[in-house]
Amino acid sequence: MMTGTIETTGNISAEKGGSIILQCHLSSTTAQVTQVNWEQQDQLLAICNADLGWHISPSFKDRVAPGPGLGLTLQSLTVNDTGEYFCIYHTYPDGTYTGRIFLEVLESSVAEHGARFQIP
């Protein structure tokens, strides 16, 4: 039985040209995390495998950095980066948990003058 829950940063916004950290946290389970996949829509951004470490998709190497922790840092943001991001936790013995984050990338002036979500 899957008892765990994924906590995410939820809906976030960031300035065009800036960076953002995508974070998920799995709680309420003793299951072992074997791998975390990060996806944007259906595209793989990165994998963090418990045994093998990080794999950053070659398509995103120029704009993605691993961490902190099991999170992922997106850099040099563009308006096209707006959309859904998913953290997919592969665990044993529970199975797969998925968290969703919605990122809105705003033009600099918009972000400065009243972004809907604050970036820590």
Epitope: N49, H55, I56, P58, S59
Partner: antibody
């Protein structure tokens, strides 16, 4: 020990398709990418694409897009590469290779595909 | 696509002498996050698949003799065989795995002088 064992040589006519298999053993199949690389007679190495057996991810060289399909069967730890609309220039040795983040460390023995009318 | 340019095309070296093969990339292969260059070197003998020698530009693969070494960062790389042995006669390829599509150099044929 890590092994990638490929299917045997194939002779095909132009316009046909070929499906080459690569059976993995000696490691956790779903953890590593499998890449396909080909080598025409007397020529260098050409990357065709990759597939991640642990998920639905694959990436193809634009040169082969629309003609190549990579699939996997986790129950048998086997990856397949199918190339369609074959032409004489596709005559080559086709290799599968294992990859994570630090290059292709184990290679299959190669499968010779000959396209001839 | 990233173009990998190898030089020389062929090289003849005497037993026990040093062999040097160069590889130049059309784009930077250094990933800022881990400060590693995504460049590998392979050895291929006739009728055999390529064999990984060096990855991340300078890390020797397990079981590879220490006479093989890799150096360089960013766009310029070198494979050095410090003291050539008869079994080193082969074709050597560099490969970038920084970005899709992965690309190889045209190869350097190493022969005995």
């Amino acid at each position: 020990q890590v092994q990638l064992v490929q299917s045997g040589a194939e002779v095909k006519k132009p316009g046909a398709s070929v499906k080459v298999s690569c059976k993995a053993s000696g490691y956790t199949f779903t953890n590593y990418w499998i890449h396909w690389v080909r080598q025409a007679p007397g020529q260098g190495l050409e990357w065709m694409g990759d597939i991640y057996p642990g998920g639905r991810y694959s990436n193809y060289n634009e040169k082969f897009r629309g003609r190549v399909t990579m699939t996997r069967d986790t129950s048998t730890s086997t990856v397949y590469m199918e190339l369609s609309s074959l032409r004489s220039e596709d005559t080559a040795v086709y290799y599968c290779a294992r990859y994570y983040e630090s290059a292709m460390d184990f290679w299959g023995q190669g499968t010779t595909v000959t396209v001839s009318s | 696509d990233i173009v990998m340019t190898q030089s020389p095309d062929s090289l003849a070296v005497s037993l026990g002498e040093r062999a040097t093969i160069n590889c130049k990339s059309s784009q930077n292969l250094l990933y800022n996050s881990n400060q590693k260059s995504y460049l590998a070197w392979y050895q291929q003998k006739p009728g055999q698949p390529p064999k990984l020698l060096i990855y991340w530009a300078s890390t020797r693969e397990s079981g590879v003799p220490d006479r093989f070494s890799g150096s360089g960062s960013g766009t310029d790389f070198t494979l050095t065989i410090s003291s050539l042995q008869a079994e080193d006669v082969a074709v050597y390829y560099c490969q970038q795995y920084y970005n899709y599509p992965f690309t190889f150099g045209a190869g350097t044929k190493l022969e005995l002088k």
